[in-house]
Amino acid sequence: ARSEDRYRNPKGSACSRIWQSPRFIARKRGFTVKMHCYMNSASGNVSWLWKQEMDENPQQLKLEKGRMEESQNESLATLTIQGIRFEDNGIYFCQQKCNNTSEVYQGCGTELRVMGFSTLAQLKQRNTLKD
């Protein structure tokens, strides 16, 4: 069987599982971040969800005009957030809704941690934890 067949759902939908990357971002306040979702097919539009706390249900992300931007091509969807703020902290999920079925696939999430300006040593420590 072809590798992509393993990710088709049992009904044989053309919709694919999606891989979200990275799983964790730690970046400074005011900086720009990007997160991605890779798909086997472009058989559905991707939207983005966000939750602030682990035990919350993710909500549709309200894109802040001029600061947040989503883009999508054949197999890649990207969310770009510029000038990140502490209130952007949380977990971001991409979600693909199939065109030909009602099924919805969701990425595993990207946790964004907005940091204050700090020393390189502190940064390296955080990066070690992240890895």
Epitope: T32, K34, G83, F117, L123
Partner: antibody, heavy 119, light 111 residues
Framework: EVQLQESGAELVKPGASVKMSCKAS????????MHWVKQRPGQGLEWIGA????????GYNQKFKGKATLTVDTSSSTAYMHLSSLTSEDSAVYFC????????????WGQGTLVTVSA | DIVLTQSPASLAVSLGQRATISCKAS??????????MNWYQQKPGQPPKLLIY???NLESGIPARFSGSGSGTDFTLNIHPVEEEDAATYHC?????????FGGGTKLEIK
């Protein structure tokens, strides 16, 4: 027209402190970060720190923590930098400059404030 | 801190010729396909002036004879053809990691 107007030259004694200003005009003050940069005579440029006027969040170069304090007055669209415990090493030209996001480029600069520390 | 090493420290270029200035970073200044490297021109008694942002983008109002290239750790500013008014000191600056740092500057003289 975007302008960053800095305060005039200062001659101060060692151990004293100084507060310089940077008055912004021609744009929405709270939409851009304000950075401060030091240049000693005949030397390179050093980033001191930055402030987001929308909420007064500050980020400093560790080298200048305890030396520089950045503040803003949004009502007058003015950024301030206070330098304390001055020594001859602090004699320099200090520039204010703005960026749209915290880590984007510096597109407009003030003319600079010359600080001379001398007994 | 990210150290930016500019070379040469000074150069003299004949009118109409090409000036090439290099800036090497001690670590990558790229993030997600964007290079956080900027170039400024500074004349005596004046503040720096933005020429190139994000490695290769020409700032509005800057003549097209200025161009920037590079990614990762190696960046270049080119001026061609050089004009009399280009005599100045040129600084590279990274804004991918705080503290933001500048190169030591390159002084361009026109022959």
């Amino acid at each position: 027209e975007v302008q960053l107007q800095e305060s005039g030259a200062e001659l101060v004694k060692p151990g004293a402190s100084v507060k310089m200003s940077c008055k912004a005009s021609g744009y929405t003050f709270t939409s851009y970060w304000m950075h401060w940069v030091k240049q000693r005579p005949g030397q390179g440029l050093e980033w001191i720190g930055a402030i987001d006027p929308s909420d007064s969040y500050t980020g400093y170069n560790q080298k200048f923590k305890g030396k520089a304090t950045l503040t803003v007055d949004t009502s007058s669209s003015t950024a301030y930098m206070h330098l304390s415990s001055l020594t001859s090493e602090d004699s320099a030209v200090y520039f204010c400059t703005r960026s749209y996001y915290g880590n984007s480029w510096f597109d407009y600069w003030g003319q600079g404030t010359l600080v001379t520390v001398s007994a | 801190d990210i150290v930016l090493t500019q070379s040469p420290a000074s150069l003299a270029v004949s009118l109409g010729q090409r000036a090439t200035i290099s800036c090497k970073a001690s670590q990558s200044v790229d993030y997600e396909g964007d290079s956080y490297m900027n170039w400024y021109q500074q004349k005596p008694g004046q503040p720096p002036k933005l020429l190139i942002y994000a490695a290769s983008n020409l700032e509005s109002g800057i003549p097209a004879r200025f161009s920037g290239s590079g990614s990762g750790t190696d960046f270049t500013l080119n001026i061609h053809p050089v004009e009399e008014e280009d005599a100045a000191t040129y600084h590279c600056q990274q804004s991918n990691e705080d503290p933001f740092t500048f190169g030591g500057g390159t002084k361009l003289e026109i022959k």
